[in-house]
């Protein structure tokens, strides 16, 4: 498979936002790239979000997506928001070179995202 690199561990902010870079080694000059974030928990894999972009253009996720991102060359900066403690898990970056042919696929080893719910503020008199 195509080589895909991503950090091993990321800690989400107190606002439930986690960011990481997904970098891939392209064999050639792809013009259309698809990036998918998958969450693996208890051997179940679910799709978190996905975006297709043209090289040189911005990465666009659907309006209701919890992901945003920017691309630069063979690097994609991904941000996942709205995370809670129960969302702690392994987030895998999948990269597909869609056009021109041939099709190339790469799967990262995953980024373990830790999310800690903030303690509620104590009532003040």
């Amino acid at each position: 498979a195509m080589h895909v690199a991503q950090p091993a561990v990321v800690l989400a902010s107190s606002r439930g936002i986690a960011s990481f870079v997904c970098e891939y080694a392209s064999p050639g000059k792809a013009t259309e790239v698809r990036v998918t974030v998958l969450r693996q928990a208890d051997s179940q894999v679910t799709e978190v979000c996905a975006a297709t972009y043209m090289m040189g253009n911005e990465l666009t996720f659907l309006d209701d997506s919890i992901c945003t991102g920017t691309s630069s060359g063979n690097q994609v900066n991904l941000t996942i928001q709205g995370l809670r403690a129960m969302d702690t898990g392994l987030y895998i970056c999948k990269v597909e070179l869609m056009y021109p042919p041939p099709y190339y696929l790469g799967i990262g080893n995953g980024t373990q995202i830790y999310v800690i719910d903030p303690e509620p503020c104590p009532d003040s008199d």
Epitope: G28, V45, M98, P102, L105
Partner: antibody
């Protein structure tokens, strides 16, 4: 127009070697990983070997059935990929295709192994 | 190594019908699955790549679906020209194993 032309097939005795060649045109050869795939009535389509390109340090991969006997190589200056096949066996008979990462395929070259 | 289980081995259908071929894998291949059509005496042709994407020049009557360990190829409104052997293939990682093939007769 994309073209892949395999040559070098023919009749070969068991235990003897043979070298297949494939010349590509119509696409940027050096941007692609190249593969050899065999078709036989017994096994259908069987992936044999892959050679990656310069960004991947020309890494090679083989199926267990040919590892140690077959060698894949490439020459980007000639847009060519090769398959050196040694110590041929009866089960190596079939049509051999070269393919640019499974998107583009040649017409195939027939290898017959017989005494 | 990733094992591919393709079924059925052969199938007969009539013009205009819809048929489905399935391919199971021994582990999650994350959508890294291609489908090919091989007509008698011809080279294999890429039909579907990445489990769901139709290859250039192929009829939209062909569609691919699936994820994880289960995938399928659907051929709608069968044409006589669809007579061929269809193969699935793991393209996630080496060895890039093919399924055993499905021979379609019309």
């Amino acid at each position: 127009e994309v073209k892949l032309d395999e040559t070098g097939g023919g009749l070969v005795q068991p235990g003897r070697p043979i070298k297949l060649s494939c010349v590509a045109s119509g696409f940027t050869f050096s941007d692609n990983w190249m593969n050899w795939v065999r078709q036989s009535p017994e096994k259908g389509l069987e992936w044999l070997a892959q050679i990656r390109n310069k960004p991947y340090n020309y890494e090679t991969y083989y199926s267990d059935s040919v590892k140690g006997r077959f060698t894949i190589s490439r020459d980007d200056s000639k847009s060519s990929v090769y398959l050196q096949m040694n110590n041929l066996r009866g089960e190596d008979m079939g049509i051999y295709y070269c393919t640019a990462q499974f998107a583009y395929w040649g017409q195939g070259t027939l290898v017959t192994v017989s005494a | 190594d990733i094992q591919m289980t393709q079924s059925p081995a052969s199938l007969s259908a009539s013009v205009g019908e819809t048929v489905t071929i399935t391919c199971g894998t021994s582990e999650n291949i994350y959508g890294g699955l291609n489908w090919y059509q091989r007509k008698q005496g011809k080279s294999p042709q890429l039909l579907i790549f990445g489990a769901t994407n139709l290859a250039d020049g192929m009829s939209s009557r062909f569609s691919g679906s699936g994820s994880g360990r289960q995938y399928s190829l659907k051929i709608s409104s069968l044409h006589p020209d669809d007579v061929a052997t269809y193969y699935c293939q793991n393209v996630l990682r080496s060895p890039f194993t093919f399924g055993s093939g499905t021979k379609l007769e019309i």
